[in-house]
């Protein structure tokens, strides 16, 4: 990018530059006509018969450098060929010299600085590539010479450019003074400001475009070269913020449209909102869940919105004494999630009718909550109680939902309590063929013992056919028809209105070997 400091082609008024010395044959400001037939202000000098060593100087007005360290001067000029000038002396030249002088203000006068090299700084001696000679008629009078020179380094507020003629017949058609700067550049969502190079290469820090954030790593920078070009170099730049995507060749971040989102900064484009979510505004980093749908705290921002599951179905209960096995089917609606678990709530009602949450004497296997499989075993049920179990299905968003959690209930009533096991059996009399037994009356919680069942078999004879039963209404019994000198295993259970209680521990008894021993009371 070039920034113009002076362009005589654009000047319409007289330039009124300073010449030295004030003599005939000096530089003269004239109107000219360029290749495009535009009128331009020019300076011409044509003193080809001067005395050797006599110089004609022309100096521009003061030009502020506007921060430029190196300034370029493009000169367009024509020059007559010495050979085609019959009266040209040996001092005729086809070159001229360019100088500059720096100052902090427009302080030069007609006589100062002294018109010589040092204080003026020589830039170059310029030779014409194309020489003008007389042409027939209206032919082009000769090609224009174009030369670009480099001034600097400059340090003061401004400068003058000066031209020294020592015997040429030439016209300065235009002077363009400019400096080069690296144009504002946006690359990889990073904006690099317009920069005037102060050295061969200058590092320039970039800043993220609107709605972009710096990428991790070193902050982005580019190098501005002295020729006004950015040095090619990969840029780790910036990336669009959440809710924005790169656009227009990675020079802008554009807000995600309604119905789309972008959850993270970085590359990638806006995506349609996931299931059960929406974005009603532009620039959404996250889509809002529809009413009744949620995202768990651990869900990614781009995850679909989900809802709590429906209730489990078809709870089946199998009561076994004080144990209960519950089993159910998965809910019809999982809510769109995989993290399904089950939990149970329990209420118990006493036979009298008062109800309360289940006490701590119940145990749940594997547990009352966080169940992964659709079953549970409940132990420690009390007899003659009615239990209500509510089975709920839960997932990762159940805790976010308000309102009642759907459940599938099941009611289970336990049997009334049977008598406890009869364990303290005594042998009161023994003979070779019989045994008389007695036991303590068990305390039956649900009414009196109605009768007892005695179960016995010879030791070693384990099959079902060898087991014999005897019912008695008293808390004693006589076992007859036994083998002589044999060992028997005896168990007793009591029956109340609630049913039979469990058999007690096996009691070991032995019959007599012969009659002479008679009845003998045996204590267990």
């Amino acid at each position: 990018l070039e920034e113009t400091l002076l362009n005589t082609k654009l000047e319409t008024a007289d330039l009124k530059w300073v010449t030295f010395p004030q003599v005939d044959g000096q530089w003269e400001e004239l109107s000219g006509l360029d290749e495009e037939q535009h009128s331009v202000r020019t300076y011409e000098v044509c003193d080809v018969q001067r005395a050797p060593g006599q110089a004609h100087w022309l100096r521009t007005g003061w030009v502020p450098r506007r921060g430029a360290v190196h300034v370029y001067a493009t000169l367009r000029f024509t020059m007559l060929e010495c050979l085609s000038l019959p009266r040209a002396g040996r001092s005729c030249k086809e070159t001229f010299t360019v100088f500059y002088y720096e100052s902090d203000a427009d302080t030069a006068t007609a006589l100062t600085p002294a018109w010589m090299e040092n204080p003026y700084i020589k830039v170059d001696t310029v030779a014409a590539e194309h020489l003008t000679r007389k042409r027939p008629g209206a032919e082009a009078t000769g090609k224009v010479n174009v030369k670009t020179l480099r001034l600097g380094p400059l340090s003061k507020a401004g400068f003058y450019l000066a031209f020294q003629d020592q015997g040429a017949c030439m016209a300065l058609l235009s002077l363009h003074l400019f400096y080069k700067k690296c144009a504002q550049l946006t690359v990889n969502l990073t904006r690099f400001p317009e920069t005037v190079p102060r050295e061969l290469v200058v590092p320039v820090a970039g800043s993220c475009v609107v709605d972009a954030v710096p990428a991790p790593g070193p902050s982005p920078s580019l190098y501005c070269r002295e020729d006004g070009q950015w040095a090619e170099q990969p840029v780790t730049g910036c990336s669009c913020a959440p809710g924005f995507e790169a656009a227009e060749g990675n020079t802008k971040c554009r807000a995600c449209a309604q119905g789309t989102f972008k959850p993270l900064s970085g590359e990638g484009s806006c995506q349609p909102c996931p299931a059960n979510s929406h974005s009603n505004t532009i620039g959404s980093a996250v889509c809002q869940c529809r009413v009744g749908y949620f995202r768990a705290r651990t869900d990614p921002r781009g995850a679909p919105c989900t809802t709590p599951p429906s209730a489990p179905r078809s709870v089946v209960s199998r009561l076994n004494g004080s144990s209960l096995h519950l089993e159910w089917s998965a809910p019809l609606e999982s809510g769109g999630r995989e993290d399904l678990t089950y939990a149970l709530r329990c209420r118990e009602c006493r036979p009298g009718g008062s109800c309360a949450p289940c006490g701590g004497d119940l145990t749940f296997d594997p547990g009352p909550r966080d169940l992964v499989e659709p079953w549970v075993v409940v132990r420690g049920l009390r007899p003659d109680f009615t239990y209500t179990f509510e089975v709920t299905a839960l997932n990762g968003v159940s805790s976010l939902a308000t309102g009642p959690v759907p459940f599938e209930p099941v009611n289970v009533t336990t049997d009334r309590e049977v008598p406890p096991a009869v364990s303290d059996i005594r042998v009161t009399r023994s003979s070779p063929s019989s045994l008389s037994l007695a036991w303590a009356v068990p305390r039956a919680p649900s009414g009196a013992v109605l009768d007892y069942e005695v179960k016995y078999h010879e030791k070693g004879a384990e099959g079902p056919s060898s087991v014999r039963f005897l019912k008695t209404s008293e808390n004693r019994a006589e076992l007859r028809g036994l083998k002589r000198g044999a060992s028997y295993l005896v168990q007793v259970r009591a029956r109340s209105e609630a049913g039979y209680g469990p058999f007690g521990q096996e009691h070991h008894s032995q019959t007599q070997l012969d009659e002479s021993e008679g009845w003998r009371e045996q204590l267990a």
């Epitope: 000219g32 020019t42 080809v48 024509t78 019959p86 008629g137 209206a138 082009a140 016209a171």
Partner: antibody, heavy 126, light 107 residues
Framework: QVQLVQSGAEVKKPGSSVKVSCKAS????????ISWVRQAPGQGLEWMGS????????DYAQKFQGRVTITADESTSTAYMELSSLRSEDTAVYYC???????????????????WGQGTLVTVSS | DIQMTQSPSSLSASVGDRVTITCRAS??????LNWYQQKPGKAPKLLIY???ILQSGVPSRFSGSGSGTDFTLTISSLQPEDFAVYYC?????????FGQGTKVEIK
């Protein structure tokens, strides 16, 4: 503004010569084209020839070839037109005119004449 | 020499009229054609050069066009001071030539 001042009116005999001068005041002279144009009474303009002083030699209209000589003196910024073997039909007003641009400051030599002298009446009569 | 033929040789017009004068060259002269205005007893005045370039200080009602052999000078709205003789002038050759002139008179 440059002025071209021509010499005064002349009365000449047929067969004689006349030399009309044209002095340019102020500024560059050598690189402009100076043309000579005549106008007989009640007639149109007639180009006779032109010179770019720095180059020395002049171009002439075929009609006047051999009879007219155009010269320039750079030191005095004066151009001259000499017409010989005068005839009565050479009675006319003779103008000098300068081109709009120098040979160095225009890309094409349009020889457009934007500065004219006041004219010199030359009468050829026996 | 290249011959320049102007037409018409004279014309009558009123103030405000649009006036067109043509000039034809005997051979191609590209755009190397100038137009002049001359009033009685005065030196000619340059109006247009390079076929269409308006000389500085000349009113914009004057315009020129053409290239090659056919050229036109147009006065878009004739003013009282425009009554004069108009000449075309070719500079393509080493030998310049003028047209014979067109006299613009008051109707």
């Amino acid at each position: 503004q440059v002025q071209l001042v021509q010499s005064g009116a002349e009365v000449k005999k047929p067969g004689s010569s006349v030399k009309v001068s044209c002095k340019a005041s102020g500024g560059t002279f050598s690189t402009y084209a100076i043309s000579w144009v005549r106008q007989a009474p009640g007639q149109g303009l007639e180009w006779m020839g032109s010179i770019i002083p720095i180059f020395g030699d002049a171009d002439y209209a075929q009609k006047f070839q051999g009879r007219v000589t155009i010269t320039a003196d750079e030191s005095t910024s004066t151009a001259y037109m000499e017409l010989s073997s005068l005839r009565s039909e050479d009675t006319a007003v003779y103008y000098c005119a300068r081109s709009s641009y120098t040979i160095l400051t225009t890309y094409y030599n349009y020889n457009a004449m934007d500065n004219w002298g006041q004219g010199t009446l030359v009468t050829v009569s026996s | 020499d290249i011959q320049m033929t102007q037409s018409p040789s004279s014309l009558s017009a009123s103030v405000g009229d649009r006036v067109t004068i043509t000039c034809r060259a005997s051979q191609n002269i590209n755009n190397f054609l100038n137009w002049y205005q001359q009033k009685p007893g005065k030196a000619p005045k340059l109006l247009i050069y390079g076929s269409s370039i308006l000389q500085s200080g000349v009113p914009s009602r004057f315009s020129g066009s053409g290239s090659g052999t056919d050229f036109t000078l147009t006065i878009s709205s004739l003013q009282p001071e425009d009554f004069a003789v108009y000449y075309c002038h070719q500079v393509s050759d080493t030998s310049d030539t003028f047209g014979q002139g067109t006299k613009v008179e008051i109707k």
